[in-house]
Interface confidence: low
């Protein structure tokens, strides 16, 4: 067995007895009788542990030696403390001249500080002012044995360390023992040595586990608020560094014109609800803490906090909600120190519109409730972005009001997957919703492994997505990488001190919002001989789905008047279209989209242009005129042929040269190439001479041509 006296957070007694006396003469601590021990034999006090050292009356003693012991009903052994006086048993030698007729009493109170670093003992002398004239010193001797089980006897002399206790005020001394964190669960052995006027008082050996004697710091952050359902919520936070859960004692008083009530409650949570709160009342609250699941010491009380309720209480005082919802306000109204009966309460909106009685409910004698149904968006009134809801009695309204914020949270989120199928960009704008001061907006999403459900819902597990404001006023968020077949359910969360609101969720399948890359290798040409505008392209690599195509084409120029043509055959790579002018430059662009209609049209491809070139042989030769010069009597005359250059529409699309075909009866047929001249002169010598002017392009000679036959007699033609 251990010869030390175990200190617990319960009271035990230190008795100093003269030799040869029996236990019956020992004095118990004040207020305790011999049979008032609790079940474990220790004397218990509900408020705080004090170790009371009491002595006998020292009358008629000249010089007496006192052996001081802590005792309990079960343990009659007296623990002795070895020290530096050659290991002798400690005795208290009392000078009868000084201490005659005086009780030698000390209150000893020890605990481990809330920071778990210092073990503190307070030694309070009940001699009162007696020691002022003496050299009064208190020392605490202590040891933290390495392994207590291996050394059941009292540690020997020299193993104790000694701390000098600070007696700033003579009646109370503070002894500080540093305890390493690793030793908090070990057993600390200690004894007190009190010296005054040459007299030494020594306590027996005491043992304590510091972790069982923690006195936490007082709870922090004590505050009060009225809950949405009209209770007073008292909240606090536990002090830092406490290695175990605490229980709390809450002491509060309510003071109003009609009632004064006090209460004392023990709770394990860090909050307490007080119901039936009254307007125009003040509530004073204090809280302290103590270990929940084992021995410990109550902390000091926190600083008192006072909370005063107004003459009209709204709960909740402010509501943030979305369009279409239903909300309720409650109110308790005190007027001239009397609470207005709830059936006499009327409600007004913005002091301009009385709310119909059908929307009222009598919750209790004093609590009235008003409910708003299917709410519309709050229209800002000047700087006010809320509606003011007033609780009034039949004659007047109190100046205080509740605030109702109704926001339209229908925010449209549109997403687009890029043509490489690597990322999805989502965009949304807040322009449709009323801005709320000090609110933040955040896109949240949940990704399912496959598809979207038929009715998107806000998933309890969601992730935020960073979005950045663009110059066009839209927010843009990028998902990368993406899972094409996953359903991304997303919504906008509006966070505000009044609460948070979520926009209706939308679900997007990246595969269904692809904006393909534009078709590539776009070519445009007017086909030779056939004379159609032929447009060809290559479909983009992604997506793999069947695609439809749109073609736009028009005469190239500053303002192209586009014509559209649609291709629904996914396998098509070209199309030929009739155009009115085969010899003009056409601009052509192609874009694509999934054939099933999902997703977006790609951007238009870069324009391709036709090149004007010969398509067919010229449609006809030029019309021409003749001038005949020479003597009418002579058989030889100069004939000059004149013609205008052939237009594009006739030449299809150019003339490289003109050829004159001659035919006479004598010389037969021959041709003359006149290049690109539009005038030709020849000598007419025969009775009949036929000429034809042909237009030649890269394809060939004109088929439909004009002929002229010269025959005698002939005259000059103008």
């Amino acid at each position: 067995f251990n010869l030390s006296y175990p200190i617990t957070p319960w009271r035990f007694k230190l008795s100093c007895m003269p030799p040869n006396s029996t236990y019956d003469y020992f004095l118990l601590p004040a207020g305790l009788s011999k049979n008032t021990s609790n079940s474990n034999g220790h004397y218990e006090t509900a408020v705080e542990p004090k170790f009371n050292s009491s002595g006998t009356h020292f009358s008629n003693l000249s010089k007496t030696t006192f052996h001081c012991c802590f005792r309990s009903e079960q343990d009659r052994n007296c623990s002795l403390c070895a020290d530096n006086i050659e290991g002798k048993t400690f005795v208290s030698t009392v000078n009868s001249l000084v201490f005659q007729q005086i009780d030698a009493n000390w209150n000893i109170q020890c605990w481990l500080k809330g920071d778990l670093k210092l073990f503190i003992c307070y030694v309070e002398s009940l001699f009162k002012n007696l020691f002022r004239n003496y050299n009064y010193k208190v020392h605490l001797l202590y040891v933290l044995p390495e392994v207590l089980e291996d050394s059941p006897l009292v540690p020997q002399k020299g193993s104790f360390q000694m701390v000098h206790c600070n007696c700033s005020v003579h009646e109370c001394c503070e002894c500080l023992v540093p305890v390493p964190t690793a030793k908090l669960n070990d057993t600390l052995l200690m004894c007190l040595k009190i010296t005054s006027g040459g007299v030494i008082f020594q306590s027996p050996l005491m043992s304590v586990q510091p972790i069982n004697m923690v006195k936490p710091d007082p709870p922090l952050g004590l505050h009060m608020e009225i809950t949405d359902d009209g209770n007073l919520k008292i909240s606090w936070s536990s002090p830092p560094l406490v290695p175990f859960p605490l229980q709390y004692q809450v002491k509060y008083s309510e003071n109003s014109t009609t009632v004064i009530r006090e209460a004392d409650k023990i709770v394990s949570a860090t909050s307490l609800l007080v119901d039936s709160i009254l307007p125009g009342s003040s509530y004073e609250v204090q809280v302290r803490g103590k270990r929940l699941d084992g021995p410990g010491i109550w902390s000091d009380w926190s600083t008192p906090r006072v909370f005063t309720t107004q003459d009209v209480i709204y709960f909740p005082p402010k509501i943030l909600t979305s369009v279409g919802s239903n909300v309720s306000f409650h109110c308790i109204y005190k007027k001239e120190n009397k609470i207005v009966p709830s059936k006499e309460i009327v409600w007004w909106m913005n002091l301009a519109e009385k709310i119909p009685q059908s929307q009222y409910d009598v919750v209790s004698d004093h609590v009235s409730k008003v409910t708003f149904f299917n709410l519309n968006e709050t229209k800002p009134r000047g700087k006010f972005t809320y509606d003011a809801v007033y609780c009034c009695n039949e004659h007047e309204c109190h100046h205080r009001y509740a605030e109702l914020y109704v926001i339209d949270v229908n925010i449209n989120i549109s997403c687009e997957t890029d043509g490489y199928l690597t990322k999805m960009t989502c965009r949304w704008s807040t322009s449709t919703i009323q801005s709320l001061a000090e609110s933040t907006l955040q896109l949240r999403y949940h990704r399912s492994s496959l598809y979207c459900s038929d009715i998107p819902s806000i998933h309890p597990i969601s992730e935020p997505k960073d979005c950045y404001l663009q110059s066009d006023g839209f927010y843009e968020c990028i998902f990368q990488p993406i899972f094409l077949l996953s359903g991304y359910t997303m919504w906008i969360r509006i966070n505000h001190s009044l609460g948070s609101l979520d926009s209706p969720p939308t679900c997007v399948l990246p595969d269904s919002v692809v904006k393909p890359l534009p078709p590539s290798s776009v070519k445009a040409e007017i086909t030779i001989n056939i004379g159609l505008l032929k447009i060809s392209w290559e479909k983009p690599v992604f997506p793999e789905n069947n695609l439809q195509f749109q073609i736009r084409y028009g005469l190239s120029g500053k303002e192209v008047q586009w014509k559209m043509y649609e291709v629904y055959d996914a396998k098509s790579k070209s199309v030929s279209l009739p155009v009115p002018d085969l010899c003009a430059v056409y601009a052509v662009q192609v874009r694509c989209k999934r054939l099933d209609g999902l997703g977006y049209w790609s951007n238009w491809s870069n324009p391709a242009y036709t090149v004007v070139m010969d398509i067919k042989v010229p449609m006809r030769g030029p019309e021409f005129w003749r001038i005949i010069n020479g003597d009418t009597m002579k058989k030889e005359k100069n004939v000059t042929l004149l013609w205008k250059p052939l237009m594009k529409n006739d030449s299809l699309c150019s003339v490289q040269r003109y050829v004159i075909n001659h035919h006479t009866s004598c010389n037969g047929t021959w041709s003359e190439d006149v290049g690109n001249h539009t005038k030709f002169t020849f000598l007419w010598t025969e009775q009949a001479h036929t000429v034809t002017v042909l237009a030649i392009n890269s394809i060939g000679a004109s088929v439909a041509n004009f002929n002229l036959t010269f025959s005698w007699p002939m005259s000059k033609v103008n």
Epitope: R447, S448, S449, L450, Y451, S453, D454, F483, L484, L485, L509, D511, S512, D596, L598
Partner: antibody, heavy 117, light 108 residues
Framework: QVQLLQSGGGVVQPGRSLRLSCAAS????????MHWVRQAPGKGLEWVAV????????YYADSVKGRFTISRDNSKNTLYLQMNSLRAEDTAVYYC??????????WGQGTLVTVSS | EIVLTQSPGTLSLSPGERATLSCRAS???????LAWYQQKPGQAPRLLIY???SRPTGIPDRFSGSGSGTDFTLTISRLEPEDFAVYYC?????????FGGGTKLEIK
């Protein structure tokens, strides 16, 4: 009780066609994506195709793309797999399976398709 | 596509023993979208685990799944005679959906 009853399997020559059916009961068929999964004799499982709950999305394994078509008739609670241009390597037990996410909660009993000349 | 490799190919154990089956992915399986199935001869597969570690109702608690990213494990804490079968893992994070090659659990 959830049931997926399959039919339509059999022996078919290469290049020919076959249609498998899968009749569902005991759960809300129209809320579930449906898959076909196959297992060649003595081999592991291979995913074949999937169709979304409303039929708007269909996806295929590369090995069957362009030859197989998955479809569904929610009014009849039935899933189909139209298999054209069948090859010897398509020989397998075909399972239909129902999903909420993309793990297979419900399985049909399987139907054997043998492609042989 | 995500390739799943199961090991060992065959595992020989006695009833009452603990079985640990491994499934490794060629790339990270997002959101732990991985399932385990049990298949007995002539029967359709049966879902044991989804979401890498969640058990559907009706699956005994001796079956447990763990892992994330690329390494996943199916553990059968105490083998019963009816547990000897082929076990497949399957990822459903990305298209195409893929299965592992299977682990055959046989009686020693």
């Amino acid at each position: 009780q959830v049931q997926l009853l399959q039919s339509g399997g059999g022996v078919v020559q290469p290049g020919r066609s076959l249609r498998l059916s899968c009749a569902a009961s005991g759960f809300t068929f129209s809320s579930y994506g449906m898959h076909w999964v196959r297992q060649a004799p003595g081999k592991g499982l291979e995913w074949v195709a999937v169709i979304s709950y409303d039929g708007s999305n269909k996806y295929y394994a590369d090995s069957v793309k362009g030859r197989f078509t998955i479809s569904r008739d929610n009014s009849k609670n039935t899933l189909y797999l139209q298999m054209n241009s069948l090859r010897a390597e398509d020989t397998a037990v075909y399972y239909c399976a129902g999903v909420r996410e993309n793990y297979f909660s419900y399985w049909g009993q399987g139907t054997l398709v043998t492609v042989s000349s | 596509e995500i390739v799943l490799t199961q090991s060992p190919g065959t595992l020989s154990l006695s009833p009452g023993e603990r079985a640990t089956l491994s499934c490794r992915a060629s790339q990270s399986v997002s959101s732990n979208y991985l399932a385990w199935y049990q298949q007995k001869p002539g029967q359709a597969p049966r879902l044991l685990i989804y979401g890498a570690s969640s058990r559907p109702t009706g699956i005994p608690d001796r079956f447990s799944g763990s892992g994330s990213g690329t390494d996943f494990t199916l553990t059968i804490s105490r083998l019963e005679p009816e547990d000897f079968a082929v076990y497949y893992c399957q990822q459903y994070a990305a298209s195409p959906l893929t299965f592992g090659g299977g682990t055959k659990l046989e009686i020693k």
